[in-house]
């Protein structure tokens, strides 16, 4: 007896699609061996139509695919545009066609719906709209028009032209009589329910000369689309419910038990706590379609999801819906990375972001998830040299360590930096990942002066004190710019005296700027790293002023200026190019922003073209605001 199992009989109609699932024991060998779908010939052979190794017969070109789901021990054969010629006996199997590892499937394709005994067949999805057309003759033009539903042996009036509406259809049905030129009336039923299915009779007139027309309404449940995504990755549900619900509240829910469908997110502002920080409901198009992105997929996210439209923002009878069955693949290609990174106020975090290593040339992005309204994720930094204005001097995206990981460093942390951040690229959208930054109590490990003023033409020495815990780390100074942080020569001045209970392994490493020029103004970072992996950083703003008295400046921790806490707004806003991200609306800034902090966002033009003084000055004034 073959261990392969599937549907013995499949019945469908012309023009339709079938999706045939075949089950196999998920042993290591079976998972990776060839899967096939073949048609049995009269003389016993079985001719391959499609296989997992890429072969597709000309008979199936452009209308069939075979997908293997190794975790579950299943493979699925999808065949579209069925014709009666597709009727026959098939096998789904593993290995070689002639071997016994197969299962027999009978496919029967019957004639498509049409006029059967003068009955018009209407096949419509649950929640959608149907228009039943009813022709009549001139002599019945002025007479009563009506639609009946056959319930058992009896016709029950549904609607008529005198204004009657059956209570089961209240608020979702209308009868339209076309202009005088057309001898036709229509009945439009919205928000179709499964119970609406059945035989209908439309009638013009009430006597023996009345015109009658039969209609068969079939209401289909939406078949969940199978979606198979990697653990820690991302999924996008595209929901197209039709223009008739363009102005109705939209929702995505997850089925729990029975008819319960727990709202995951809706356009009325509801969001399930389990999805906080990792979900966005995309702005909807004029046609009512929208999409929902969920990142940082977890094992428990697997399940059946429905999207729909209803004024309540949740599933109700008659909601037009679309369905998905999400499977989360635990043999993920997306590497583990911390989902929570903790940083001390005043210090820094270094976040490692995974990306598809096949896409090393893709543009890398980092954005801050905002929960307001339906969620959005405005960009903060990218790998092409753009940094949101309020983050100048304290945020850097580095291509290191490379080979599938980039690094984002954020320093000068405040409690306002706590939140969810997304790592993404303009390549594979499945590789969007989420990290939560938490701000904790404590003291920064690196000690640097506050903001420093250098004198033109003089020498400036800026100290950075490293505690002994960093003795094995490489210590560096660099100058921040919007493409990264360029390393600078520094001097090890021996043990630091800035730490209590710290032995000779503590270090004072100084940055020396000789013959200071205007170009030296800006942000400088000292930090630690191990190879290409970055640790803590500390930032110092160096301002440059005219000479007052001769000599060099050696800045100590005590002499440091406090950074002024002023708000300076930049005009303009950041718009993401279409080429950069597949759906730019997910990340584009909105022009109307309630909080002035969000308006302090320079456009790319102002960042690229401004002089170093302008950039430095503006950074200096509002680096605390974001």
């Amino acid at each position: 007896k073959s261990p392969i199992f599937g549907p013995e009989e499949v019945n469908s109609v012309e023009g339709n699609s079938v999706s045939i699932t075949c089950y196999y024991p998920p042993t290591s060998v079976n998972r990776h061996t060839r899967k096939y779908w073949c048609r049995q010939g009269a003389r016993g052979g079985c001719i391959t139509l499609i296989s997992s190794e890429g072969y597709v017969s000309s008979k199936y070109a452009g209308r069939a695919n075979l997908t293997n789901f190794p975790e579950n021990g299943t493979f699925v054969v999808n065949i579209a545009q069925l014709s009666q010629d597709d009727s026959g006996r098939y096998k789904c199997g593993l290995g070689i066609n002639s071997r016994g590892l197969s299962f027999d499937v009978s496919l029967e394709v019957s004639q498509g719906p049409g006029l059967l005994n003068d009955t018009k067949v209407y096949t419509v999805d649950l929640g959608r709209t149907v228009t039943i057309n009813c022709p009549f003759k001139t002599e019945n033009a002025q007479k009563r028009k009506s639609l009946y539903k056959q319930i058992g042996l009896y016709p029950v009036l549904v609607i008529d032209s005198s204004g009657y509406v059956n209570p089961n259809y209240t608020g979702r049905i209308r009868l339209d009589i076309q202009g005088t030129g057309q001898l036709l009336f229509s009945v439009v039923i919205n928000q179709l329910r499964l119970s609406d299915a059945g035989q209908y009779l439309c009638q013009a007139g009430d006597d023996s000369n009345s015109n009658k027309k039969n209609a068969d309404l079939q209401v289909l449940k939406p078949e969940p689309e199978l979606v198979y995504e990697d653990l820690r990755g991302s999924v996008t549900f595209h929901c197209a419910l039709g223009p008739e619900v363009a102005n109705v509240a939209k929702f995505l829910c997850r089925q729990s038990s029975g008819e319960n469908c727990d709202v995951v997110v809706n356009t009325l502002g509801k969001r399930a706590p389990a999805f906080e920080g990792r979900i966005l409901l995309n702005p909807q198009d004029k046609d009512g379609s929208f999409s929902v992105v969920i990142t940082g997929l977890r094992k428990e996210d697997a399940g059946r999801y429905l999207c729909g439209a209803h004024s309540d923002g949740q599933l109700q009878e008659g909601s037009p819906i679309q369905a998905w069955q999400l499977f989360v693949n635990e043999e993920s290609t997306i590497p583990r990375s911390p989902t929570v990174v903790k940083g001390v106020a005043g210090s820094s975090v270094a976040v490692l972001c995974p990306y598809n290593r096949k896409e090393s040339k893709s543009i890398k992005y980092w954005c801050l998830w905002e929960g307001a309204q339906n969620g959005r994720c405005p960009l903060l930094v990218d790998s092409e040299g753009w940094v949101k204005a309020q983050y100048e001097g304290r945020l850097s995206l580095l291509e290191e360590p490379g080979n599938g990981t980039f690094t984002v460093i954020l320093n000068q942390l405040t409690s306002r930096d706590a939140g969810f951040y997304w790592c993404l690229t303009n390549g594979d959208t499945l590789w969007r990942t989420t990290v939560e930054i938490k701000i904790i109590e404590g003291e920064p490990n690196l000690k640097v002066p506050g903001n420093v003023t250098a004198v033109l033409g003089e020498t400036l020495k800026v100290p950075c004190h490293f505690p002994c815990k960093f003795s094995s780390y490489e210590k560096y100074w660099c100058k921040w710019n919007n493409t990264g942080c360029q390393a600078l020569p520094s001097q090890d001045e021996g043990p630091s005296k800035a730490f209590v209970n710290c032995d000779e392994n503590s270090r004072l490493v100084s940055l020396t700027l000789n013959l200071v020029t205007r170009a030296d103004e800006g942000w400088y970072w000292c930090g630690v790293k191990q190879g290409h992996f970055y640790g803590e950083t500390a930032a110092v703003y160096v301002a440059v002023e005219e000479r007052k008295a001769a000599g060099s400046r050696d800045v100590s921790l005590a002499k440091a200026d406090a950074a002024p806490d002023e708000k300076v707004l930049d005009s303009g806003f950041r718009e993401i190019e279409n080429k950069a991200i597949q759906d730019p609306r997910l990340f584009a800034e909105e022009k109307a922003v309630a909080d002035t902090r969000d308006q302090a966002d320079g456009s790319r033009a102002s960042v690229d073209s401004g002089s170093s003084e302008e950039q430095g000055g503006s950074s200096r004034h509002h680096h605390h605001h974001h």
């Epitope: 499949v10 469908s12 109609v13 339709n16 089950y23 029975g258 319960n260 059946r304």
Partner: nanobody
């Protein structure tokens, strides 16, 4: 609350026929799979047959021991399920359970893959 209610069980002679029915009024909108299992005294629950709907397509699955003798049918919109049993044998004696809404990725033949169950109806085939 989802309730699956079986009917049609009884006592018949070998080679007779019997038709079982199942109604599942509370099933979720998107449920599109229903099936039959049976359990004889002292034995594990065994897969009998299942039916799935997708759009205008219908998929029928059968257990090895009933192929060619039993026919599964149903109405997706009404959440009803029938099992026409012909050529009954004494070894078909069991409690027959209606099941609904399996895990999309589970093997339909395993009872653990199904979410909802009826209370069962007894079928006894005497020789």
């Amino acid at each position: 609350e989802v309730q699956l209610v079986e009917s049609g069980g009884g006592v018949v002679q070998a080679e007779d026929s019997l038709r079982l029915s199942c109604a599942a009024p509370g099933l979720p909108f998107s449920s599109s799979r229903m099936g039959w299992f049976r359990q004889a005294p002292g034995k594990e629950r065994e897969f009998v047959a299942a039916i799935g709907w997708s759009g205008r397509s219908t998929y029928r699955y059968y257990g090895d021991s009933v192929k060619g003798r039993f026919t599964v049918s149903g109405d997706n919109a009404k959440n009803t399920l029938d099992l026409q049993m012909k050529g009954l044998k004494p070894e078909d004696t069991a409690v027959y359970y209606c099941a609904a809404d399996p895990d999309y990725y589970g093997d339909y033949r395993t009872s653990g893959a199904w979410r909802y169950w009826g209370q069962g109806t007894q079928v006894t085939v005497s020789s």
